[in-house]
Interface confidence: low
């Protein structure tokens, strides 16, 4: 089963069209803007819900950096190419000839260009780092609580392996998690880090990609944990190239 | 391969305790959740304890404040003790161990079971 | 508790695909996990030929399959044969409950 037999609808994709054309008359669902078809079983790849969320109205988006070549999505929101399964080309352009190279999390890693920019590859991010904010509470949280229900939360709601959670850090109000996924790792059918971040991403914000599901109601010992500001770190196996004006 | 082995069954006196072991091989001890499950004779499986690889515990209804599980990683052991035996304890007990370390809430996880231990209740 | 509902028995002759239906587990963020064990006889040890909704033991053969719709977990095994006429129990996440169990027999 791809999706919700009895009404038809993709549990893990609120931004696809249904309908029970699949093989006996099962359940398909495909995505919006692409139109490719998704497995309703696990999560949507990212580069997929780029691309739904620009044939929708557009929404605006973004302590330690793990080092100097972190990478944090300061570009927004853009309609990108992907590839028949549904990751991100390597190479991105806009209606303007202007092109940049990507990594496998659709963030920038390289100065823009024009058409006759190369992107041999694409690159694996490989480390994310959330680095979460949480409002105040009465005291801070256990932080042995915190790390198991982040875990669990990952694991459950995002279906992310335990293994790909490095680490849970916490300095209240400060909460890092790292996810960590080498392309060796990565078996065939496990979610990629860069989907659960970007699921995650979407939930603490209020905008859960789920279908039909309330909010992120996340609660450690029956406390609620409300994020009030998220930044991303994403790492590559291949250290980013911009030029040096970039960073001046 | 993995293999789990039980020890401490056997006929027990009603209101007295019983401690089962499962020793573990072949595997990762410490970074998986073990528990035991349950039959009584003609019954289904009944869900007992288990123990996180980060060491929360879980406990079936029936045996909440009468059961407590442990680990010794180094051994690659886990124990539960029963208290206040009942003849309802009666049952064969299976050691089972999960695919996955994070959880105490494992029953849809177990990926491995031992050839169980038989526990007889009586007096 | 919450009680796991699945049928008291099905039947199928060799060769045919069979499904077995597990429901109402109790759900986590909004997701349900179901794990199926096999038991052969009573008293003997079971064997688990799914855990976590899809996954299957490396000792399993590849006919067994997991799949999720919902609330509710299917166990198919695709080309029954005579060796897997035994009990079937679904267990469930959180809850913590295993079902009464699934009697297949192969005609």
């Known amino acids: 089963h791809t999706a919700a037999q009895d009404n038809c609808t993709c549990p893990t994709n609120k931004m696809t069209v249904c309908s029970p054309d699949g093989p006996g008359g099962r359940c398909q669902c495909r995505a919006l803007g692409s139109g490719v078809a998704v497995d309703c079983s696990t999560l949507t790849s990212k580069c997929l819900l780029l691309k739904a969320r620009m044939s929708a109205p557009k929404n605006a988006r973004t302590l330690v950096r793990p080092n100097e070549h972190a990478l944090v999505d300061n570009d927004g929101l853009y309609d990108p190419d992907c590839d028949p399964e549904g990751r991100f080309k390597a190479r991105q352009c806009n209606q303007t000839s202007v092109c940049w190279c990507v990594n496998s999390v659709g963030v920038r890693r390289t100065d823009k260009g024009d058409l006759s920019l190369r992107c041999d590859e694409l690159v694996r991010t490989h480390h994310i780092l959330i680095d979460l904010r949480h409002r105040p509470t009465a005291g801070a949280f256990n932080h042995s609580d915190l790390d198991a229900e982040l875990r669990r939360l990952f694991r459950e709601r995002y279906r992310l392996h335990p293994k790909f959670v490095a680490a849970v850090h916490y300095e209240q109000p400060t909460i890092q998690i790292e996810l960590r996924q080498n392309t060796s790792q990565k078996a065939a059918g496990d979610v990629d880090i860069g989907d659960a971040a970007y699921y995650f991403e979407r939930d603490v914000k209020g905008e859960s990609l789920f279908q039909g599901r309330g909010g992120l109601d996340l609660r450690v010992r029956g406390e609620p944990l409300q994020v009030e500001r998220t930044l991303i770190y994403y790492l590559d196996e291949i250290p980013p190239k911009f030029s040096m004006k970039r960073l001046t | 391969a993995v293999t789990l082995d039980e020890s401490g069954g056997g006929l027990q006196t009603p209101g007295g305790a019983l401690s089962l072991v499962c020793k573990g091989s072949?595997?990762?001890?410490?970074?998986?959740?073990m528990g035991w499950v349950r039959q009584a004779p003609g019954k289904g499986l009944e869900y007992v304890a288990a123990?996180?690889?980060?060491?929360?515990?879980g406990y079936g209804a029936a045996v909440k404040g009468r059961a407590t599980i442990s680990k010794d990683t180094g051994q690659s052991t886990v124990r539960l003790q029963l208290n206040n035996l009942r003849a309802e304890d009666t049952a064969t007990y299976y050691c089972?161990?999960?695919?996955?370390?994070?959880?105490?809430?494992?029953?849809?996880?177990?990926?491995?079971w031992g050839h169980g231990t038989e526990v007889i209740v009586s007096s | 508790a919450l009680a796991l509902t699945q049928p008291s028995s099905v039947s199928a002759n060799p060769g045919e695909t069979v499904e077995i239906t597990c429901s109402g587990g109790?759900?986590?963020?909004?997701?349900?996990?179901y794990g199926w064990y096999q038991q052969k006889a009573p008293g003997s040890a079971p064997v688990t030929v799914i855990?976590?909704?899809?996954k299957r033991p490396s000792n399993i053969p590849s006919r067994f399959s997991g799949s999720t719709s919902g609330s509710t977990n299917t166990l198919t095994i695709t080309g029954v044969q005579a060796d897997d006429e035994a009990i079937y129990f679904c267990?469930?996440?959180?809850?913590?409950?295993f079902g009464a169990g699934t009697t297949l027999t192969v005609l």
């Open positions: 089972a161990k999960s695919g996955y370390g994070g959880s105490a809430s494992y029953v849809s996880d177990i990926d491995a």
């Open positions: 072949g595997f990762t001890f410490s970074s998986y959740a």
């Open positions: 123990i996180s690889s980060g060491s929360s515990t």
């Open positions: 109790g759900d986590y963020y909004g997701t349900y996990y």
């Open positions: 855990y976590d909704n899809t």
């Open positions: 267990g469930s996440y959180k809850s913590n409950t």
